[in-house]
Amino acid sequence: MAVTACQGLGFVVSLIGIAGIIAATCMDQWSTQDLYNNPVTAVFNYQGLWRSCVRESSGFTECRGYFTLLGLPAMLQAVRALMIVGIVLGAIGLLVSIFALKCIRIGSMEDSAKANMTLTSGIMFIVSGLCAIAGVSVFANMLVTNFWMSTANMYTGMGGMVQTVQTRYTFGAALFVGWVAGGLTLIGGVMMCIACRGLAPEETNYKAVSYHASGHSVAYKPGGFKASTGFGSNTKNKKIYDGGARTEDEVQSYPSKHDYV
């Protein structure tokens, strides 16, 4: 039950995280104009990964896409790449984890397969979260560097004549969304990995050994009680829980109409 809960919670947390990463990637407010020097500006600038925008006090907002690849800073391209990789890995992870969920039965998928899928999706979520955190952190570092550079030479112009007051940019809402979303995806991935351990404890290879008990003898074949079930013989080693007190077949619930989603 705890394993199912951990797996389910990990899935939900990762889902929220990935939705957040997608939202952050699409948001325009990665960097916003620093209003420290001009708190009553009638023009507010903000920039995203894909376009820059200007919001006037009149309510009019104009956004322009970055219609160039070669002209963009390498760091911005790197951040875009990290975020996209994070989204792709996260999406694949979600797809895999849906089939790995213990509460969902797909045909006669065994727990070992579900455990592997849970681990795979968990690792994907962790990498996805790390990509998002890395992407946002790289962008934040770029902002900090540019901020102090523009502060150092606040006024740019020729011959000492003040021409343009440089616009300084500070952290936008998307950065915080990205950090939180990346963290959630990472946490969700860790939870999936923990759930995987619960689904697949250490395998013990049981050899065909005869145990002589008083009165009668029982030969334990590889595969536990599989031979005695109506599903036919199974020659694969099966995991036996609680020191062999009961096999997974004893606790296995048979497919019902509610199991298929």
């Epitope: 104009q33 001009n38 009553v40 500006t41 009638a42 023009v43 600038n45 903000y46 920039q47 820059s52 925008c53 200007v54 006037e56 006090s57 009149s58 309510g59 009019f60 104009e62 322009r64 003040v162 021409q163 343009t164 007051v165 440089q166 616009t167």
Partner: antibody, heavy 118, light 113 residues
């Protein structure tokens, strides 16, 4: 057709109060920021106050800060300017104006005259 | 506050002749985000409210004759009338629309000779 009609002007004694109104029609009032601009007799234009479309942002000129209050009723398509502690230097024609892109004032009312005198 | 200084304060022009009004701001009105200058020009005819002529320093408002043109960037701006007509008389104002308070210039009175 866009129309802005100011009202509420008149003669008032120094220290008195007055409430100006600006009735808007011909456009979606709730989508536009609005301003009050004044012009003293024979003088130039002086910006007075601004209110954003949803009343979230309000700015005042230093000369009226603390004495004047701008507000709006989007349901009634009306802009207001509550003027308290009036001084002789507040005597002017008060115009309401609509805010448009470029942060420009594209439509102006005909103005209402406020005279502060004892 | 941004101080707007207009020159000349008065101008007398013969119909058909060009006219030019200068406007200087104490701070740059150029917004780096969209590379637009937040300066607006208005014309106030006698007994009327002001009328919008040009915004973003050079964009003509719809319905404004093409003889009116705006130019300049940063702190120096100019309004040009290619051929002055009798109906162009009035006071021309430039306005800072970059930061509050949205200050106006003192105005330039255009008269016909």
């Amino acid at each position: 057709d866009v129309q802005l009609v100011e009202s509420g002007g008149g003669l008032v004694q120094p220290g008195g109060s007055l409430r100006l109104s600006c009735a808007a029609s011909g456009f979606t009032f709730s989508s536009f920021g609005m301003h009050w601009v004044r012009q003293a007799p024979g003088k130039g234009l002086e910006w007075v106050a601004f209110i954003s479309s949803g009343s979230h942002t309000i700015y005042y000129a230093d000369s009226v800060k603390g004495r004047f209050s701008i507000s709006r009723d989007n349901a009634k398509n009306t802009l207001f300017l509550q003027m308290n502690s009036l001084r002789a230097e507040d005597t002017a024609v008060y115009y309401c104006a609509r805010f448009q892109y470029g942060n420009s004032f594209d439509y102006w009312g005909q103005g209402t005259l406020v005279t502060v005198s004892s | 506050d941004v101080v707007m200084t207009q020159t000349p304060l008065s101008l007398s022009v013969t119909p058909g002749q060009p006219a030019s009004i200068s406007c200087k701001s104490s701070q740059s009105l150029l917004n780096s985000g969209n590379q637009k200058n937040y300066l607006t020009w208005y014309l106030q005819k006698p007994g009327q409210p002001p009328k919008l002529l040009i915004y973003w320093a050079s964009t003509r408002e719809s319905g404004v004759p093409d003889r009116f043109s705006g130019s300049g960037s940063g702190t120096d701006f100019t309004l040009k009338i290619s051929r002055v007509e009798a109906e162009d008389v009035g006071v021309y104002y430039c306005q800072n629309t970059y930061s509050f308070p949205l200050t106006f210039g003192q105005g330039t009175k255009l008269e016909i000779k």
